[in-house]
């Protein structure tokens, strides 16, 4: 079903992740082309009967869109012409998750490159002192993750140390019954110390750390994507 | 110019099975969904399924579920539309479309279910 | 499904007089973000594939004569023949592309009178 006699020209396609509910990118880059009317660009989807989004002629051309991805789809149309293909996909669903191809037509040629794309949640953890318990406590939270992650203890102090014994995590599932909320709190925590609670899931990894010392607290918190250079 | 071109008619006695091709000339078809519509004698025009050739990706009409197998081969640019269990009622003529807009079709391919 | 009615069953007009057709959707083919309505309309003619002339209810596609016109939105469309041509006889279908599976009116017969 291709075009016979022109040459193929490089597309390139980065893995990525979705945050559920929120706007994500699919990014694709091609060999740029001097006429925007001459560049066509089809985002398709495995499983997906329609197109996720097609641009030709200089601007959206939404007949063949799948009626999943109605509304929800968008090019950066200024820089199509630099050799940007990318995706803005708005409010990102689970089902979202799959085997994408970035097909690229220009006067040079044609093109297409595949992209695995995750789905899930992920969101910063925040840690902070507990003081309406008993024994000195840690209280680490992240309002969206799924799937659902592990969390794991470490300390600057007790490196290699095992804190499951002393710290208990819950998971609570939010009204939109797909992501939860991560509670874990970690007992007997000594002062002039710093905590770290990990989050982990196969899409991220977040880290909240708190330093706690007899004068001050101080917090940092970090995410990186697992498996994706976006 | 983009053009589908259909196998010719079909025979077929009742309980067999028909498959019928359409090959796709003069455009870039992989990306675009290759749909079955098929119309009995007299009758409106209904659509049976299509399929994303690119992916292998295919959908079916509630009524063909079970009894319709819709598949592409991107090496020859064709796709093919096979029904089984076939019944009177399915004689018609079946259509290859492309494009959940049929803006191109084949010329048809007239299948009589007769014993 | 969406369940596609026209009306009415078929249609006689006289040559260079207007005809029209009628088609409801059982449901909604606007999709309000865009406000483009999911409908297109098909002609007919005997021994050959249906041809499209009309998407988003009311674009004609290229080469399509433009005594040819489409409107409507929601639930109810016409298409319009300002001049009826000998050539325009045929049947004439509807079809909703607003969701899967893809569904037609059940046509349109238009001849001349």
């Known amino acids: 079903f291709g075009i016979s006699g022109r040459h193929s020209i490089t597309v390139t396609t980065v893995a990525s992740a979705g945050n559920i509910g929120e706007d994500g990118i699919l990014s694709c880059t091609f060999e740029p082309d001097i006429k925007l009317s001459d560049i066509v660009i089809q985002w398709l989807k495995e499983g997906v009967l329609g197109l996720v989004h097609e641009f030709k002629e200089g601007k959206d051309e939404l007949s063949e869109q799948d009626e999943m991805f109605r509304g929800r789809t968008a090019v950066f149309a200024d820089q199509v012409i630099v050799g940007n293909a990318s995706l803005r996909l708005k409010n990102v669903q689970l089902t979202d998750a799959g085997t994408y191809k970035c097909y690229i037509i220009t006067s040079k040629g044609k093109g297409n490159a595949n992209l695995e794309y995750k789905t899930g949640a992920f969101s910063m953890p925040e840690v902070n002192v507990d003081y309406n318990a008993s024994s000195e406590t840690l209280r680490c939270e992240a309002p969206r993750w799924f799937p659902q992650p592990t969390v794991v203890w470490a300390s600057q102090v007790d490196q290699g140390a095992n804190f499951s014994e002393v710290s208990n995590t819950s998971f609570e599932l939010n009204s939109e019954n797909v992501t939860m909320k991560v509670v874990s709190v970690l007992y007997n925590v000594t002062i002039n110390n710093t905590y770290s609670c990990m989050i982990e899931n196969d899409i991220a990894k977040a880290t909240g750390d708190i330093k706690v010392t007899e004068s001050e607290i101080k917090r940092r918190s970090h995410l990186q994507l697992l498996n994706s250079k976006a | 110019q983009v053009q589908l071109v259909q196998s010719g008619a079909e025979v077929k006695k009742p309980g067999s099975s028909v498959k019928v091709s359409c090959k796709a000339s003069?455009?870039?078809?992989?990306?675009?969904?290759i749909n079955w519509v098929r119309q009995a004698p007299g009758q409106g025009l209904e659509w049976m399924g299509g399929?994303?050739?690119?992916?292998?990706?295919?959908r079916y009409a509630q009524k063909f579920q079970g009894r319709v197998t819709i598949t592409a081969d991107e090496s020859t640019s064709t796709a093919y539309m096979e029904l089984s269990s076939l019944r009177s009622e399915d004689t018609a003529v079946y259509y290859c479309?492309?494009?959940?807009?049929?803006?191109?079709w084949g010329q048809g391919t007239l299948v009589t279910v007769s014993s | 499904d969406i369940v596609m009615t026209q009306s009415p069953d078929s249609l006689a007009v006289s040559l260079g007089e207007r005809a029209t057709i009628n088609c409801k959707s059982s449901?909604?083919?606007?999709?309000?973000?865009?406000?483009?309505?999911?409908l297109a309309w098909y002609q007919q003619k005997p021994g050959q594939p249906p041809k499209l002339l009309i998407y988003?209810?009311?674009t004609r596609e290229s080469g399509v004569p433009d005594r040819f016109s489409g409107s409507g939105s929601g639930t109810d469309f016409t298409l319009t023949i300002s001049s009826l041509q000998a050539e325009d006889v045929a049947v004439y279908y509807c079809?909703?592309?607003?969701?899967?599976?893809?569904?037609f009116g059940q046509g349109t017969r238009l001849e001349i009178k």
């Open positions: 003069g455009g870039t078809f992989s990306t675009y969904a």
């Open positions: 399929i994303n050739p690119m992916f292998g990706t295919a």
């Open positions: 988003w209810a009311s």
């Open positions: 079809q909703q592309y607003y969701t899967t599976p893809i569904t």
């Open positions: 479309a492309r494009g959940r807009l049929h803006r191109h």
């Open positions: 449901q909604s083919v606007l999709y309000s973000s865009n406000n483009k309505n999911y």
